[in-house]
Structures are given as structure tokens and as C-alpha cells.
């Protein structure tokens, strides 16, 4: 069964700044990578970024950047602007569409006692969609 | 086919007010950002506003900051932008907008004109 | 804010011909750039993203290209329907900003 996992980092030198980081564990080719936050996308998540293999990104306020670092795995950074960052108790979902399994779309979150440069570990929490 | 139809346009007089609607069919409404951008008599372009897709983010340059407010009604499928304090230079052609997947401001209305005039 | 220039307002050209429409902006933008043609009386159309990635649906004579700061949308055999004009927009950035516009006239 495929998998998707979530990491969700603190920057260490930059307290306002997170980075997501998300991979896909199965076969075939991923066709788009949707990031949202606040749950999962379409279901009360707001879209951050979507990344197409080809195409290039698109991304929106808070994030700063988003690339691919392998063909099955995404980074996105995100910037906050305010004094205190809302990115700690937030939940981030990346969602793989892939051929031929379909969609598979999981969430994570930095730790609540995480400290900078920690990672929440990448353990998928599956929300099963394959679509 | 994707269909996006402006409404509200008129004359108004400077310091006053004006709702904008845009009428979206063709596409699913609830899970694309939607922007207004509007376009001066002089031809020039301007991103006015942002609304994320769940409606729980929106984006303003400096110039229209705290004067106009961009909203969605999901059931209706109809974006708004309302626009209040109004200036002589927010005359323009305002045009409703969205994307596909990641080409930015790929489909656009026909336009509503609004003109500031006293 | 970052100023998308397109330093000729006006560009002459004939049928049959190529030409290069060009933009700067005023810091880098990366490739986030596309490239709009508005018709005379029309709604703009999305042409180009990406700085050069051509839109569904849009003729392979248009091509875009450039990064950072210098961007180029050329039309090789340029037909009558191109009677235009052409915008620039970068999206690396809030606030989104667009060039001033190029009118592309036909000889």
C-alpha cells in the first residue's frame, strides 16, 4: 500500500521559519503534490503550494519556496511575518496524486515541545483518500 | 466550460461605496483561490485582492488595504469584492480571476467597469 | 514593490515576422513570470507561465524566456489575430505587479 509521510521542521536559526518536508513511499508516477494547511486539501485546508513534475510550482503567502528534492519528495518553506509564529500547532497535509494508485494524503506537525532544528518524525498519519 | 461573470459596476461618487460580484460556474468554486484585478483607463493591470481557497486567508496590496474586503459565498458559488472609501484613481475595469493548477490568473470575466466621479 | 518595466510601449511589426517583446524587473524574480495578451476590447489571456511554459491552448509561435530579472516573450511568424497588447506579471512576490504593457501593431 502506498504511503505518504510528513515532516514538519523548525528552522534553527529562524524561529519564524518552518520548513515541510513530504514523501511518497509506493510505485508509480506522481502527477501533482498539493500542500494545505489546516487539514487536509478540500476539507477545510488552505492550499499552499502545488507542485507539477513538469509544469513548475505555485505557491501562496505564508510559503516562501517550494521544490522538489526527489522524484517522490517535495520541500516547502514558509515564511511568518507577525511577531509570533502560527506554524507551531498547525497542521500540514501533503497530497500525492499518483498513477495508477490515485491520491494518498497525509498530515503532521511540529512536535509541541520540539525544539529548533527538530523534525516531527515521518510517520505518515494516513487519511485514507485514494481517489 | 469555466465561467466567471462580473457584476456592480457603476458611477460612484468619491468616499463612497460599492459591492462587486462575480458569478462562477465551470469549475469546482470551493477549491481555487480567486483575486480581483483591476485594470486603470490607461491600460494598467493591478492585482486588487487574494482569497485562499477554504476563505480563511486574504491578500491586499497597500493601496487598498482596509478599504476593500474580497469574500465567497461557497454556496452560491460567487466571489465579492466590496469596496468602500473610494478615490478617483480606484476608476478601473475589475476583473474577476482564478487559476488552473499552477498558471496564475488563467481564466478571467468580461469585466464590471466601476468609475469614481464626483 | 517590485517594477516590471517594459520599455517600448509601442512595437511595429508585418506579418510573417518575429518579434521579441521584452520585460525587467526591478529585483530578481526567479522565473515566476507570465506573459498576458489582451485583444481590443477583450479580457487579458494567460499566454505564458513560469517565464517560459506556453498556456492550453496557446500557438507554439509564442515562446517565452529569461529569469531573475530580464524576461522575453517572442512570436516567430507573427499573424493579423496578434494585434495586441502584451503584459508582463511577476508572482514571485506580494504585491503581484505587472509591466506596463507592449502594443504590438501590424505593419
Known amino acids: 500500500t502506498p504511503e505518504v509521510w510528513v515532516q514538519v521542521q523548525m528552522e534553527a536559526t529562524e524561529l519564524s521559519s518552518f520548513t515541510v518536508h513530504c514523501g511518497f513511499l509506493g510505485p508509480g508516477s506522481i502527477s501533482l503534490v498539493t500542500v494545505s494547511w489546516g487539514g487536509p486539501d478540500g476539507a477545510g485546508g488552505t492550499k499552499l503550494a502545488v507542485l507539477h513534475p513538469e509544469l513548475g510550482t505555485r505557491q501562496w503567502a505564508p510559503a516562501r519556496q517550494a521544490r522538489w528534492e526527489t522524484q517522490s519528495s517535495i520541500s516547502l518553506a514558509l515564511e511568518d511575518s507577525g511577531a509570533s509564529s502560527p506554524f507551531a500547532n498547525t497542521t500540514f497535509c501533503c497530497k500525492f496524486a499518483s498513477f495508477p494508485e490515485g491520491s494518498w494524503e497525509s498530515c503532521g506537525s511540529l512536535p509541541p515541545s520540539s525544539d529548533p532544528g527538530l523534525s516531527a518524525p515521518p510517520t505518515p498519519v494516513p487519511i485514507l483518500r485514494a481517489d | 466550460d469555466v465561467q466567471l461573470v462580473e457584476s456592480g459596476g457603476g458611477l460612484v461618487k468619491p468616499g463612497g461605496s460599492l459591492k462587486l460580484s462575480c458569478a462562477a460556474s465551470?469549475?469546482?468554486?470551493?477549491?481555487?483561490?480567486m483575486y480581483w484585478v483591476r485594470q486603470t483607463p490607461e491600460k494598467r493591470l493591478e492585482w486588487v485582492a487574494t482569497i485562499s481557497d477554504g476563505a480563511s486567508y486574504t491578500y491586499y496590496p497597500d493601496n487598498v488595504k482596509g478599504r476593500f474586503t474580497i469574500s465567497r459565498d461557497t454556496a452560491k458559488n460567487n466571489l465579492y469584492l466590496q469596496m468602500s472609501h473610494l478615490k478617483s484613481e480606484d476608476t478601473a475595469m475589475y476583473y474577476c480571476t482564478r487559476d488552473e493548477l499552477i498558471a496564475p490568473f488563467a481564466y478571467w470575466g468580461q469585466g464590471t467597469l466601476v468609475t469614481v466621479s464626483a | 514593490d517590485i517594477v516590471m518595466t517594459q520599455s517600448h510601449k509601442f512595437m511595429s511589426t508585418s506579418v510573417g515576422d518575429r518579434v521579441s517583446i521584452t520585460c525587467k524587473a526591478s529585483?530578481?524574480?526567479?522565473?515566476?513570470v507570465a506573459w498576458f495578451q489582451q485583444k481590443p476590447g477583450q479580457s487579458p489571456k494567460l499566454l505564458i507561465y513560469?517565464?517560459?511554459t506556453r498556456h492550453t491552448g496557446v500557438p507554439d509561435r509564442f515562446t517565452g524566456s529569461g529569469s531573475g530579472t530580464d524576461f522575453t516573450l517572442t512570436i516567430s511568424n507573427v499573424q493579423s489575430e496578434d494585434l495586441a497588447d502584451y503584459f508582463c506579471q511577476q508572482y514571485n512576490s506580494y504585491p503581484w505587479t505587472f509591466g506596463g504593457g507592449t502594443k504590438l501593431e501590424i505593419k
Open positions: 513560469w517565464a517560459s
Open positions: 529585483q530578481d524574480v526567479g522565473t515566476a
Open positions: 465551470g469549475f469546482s468554486f470551493s477549491e481555487n483561490y
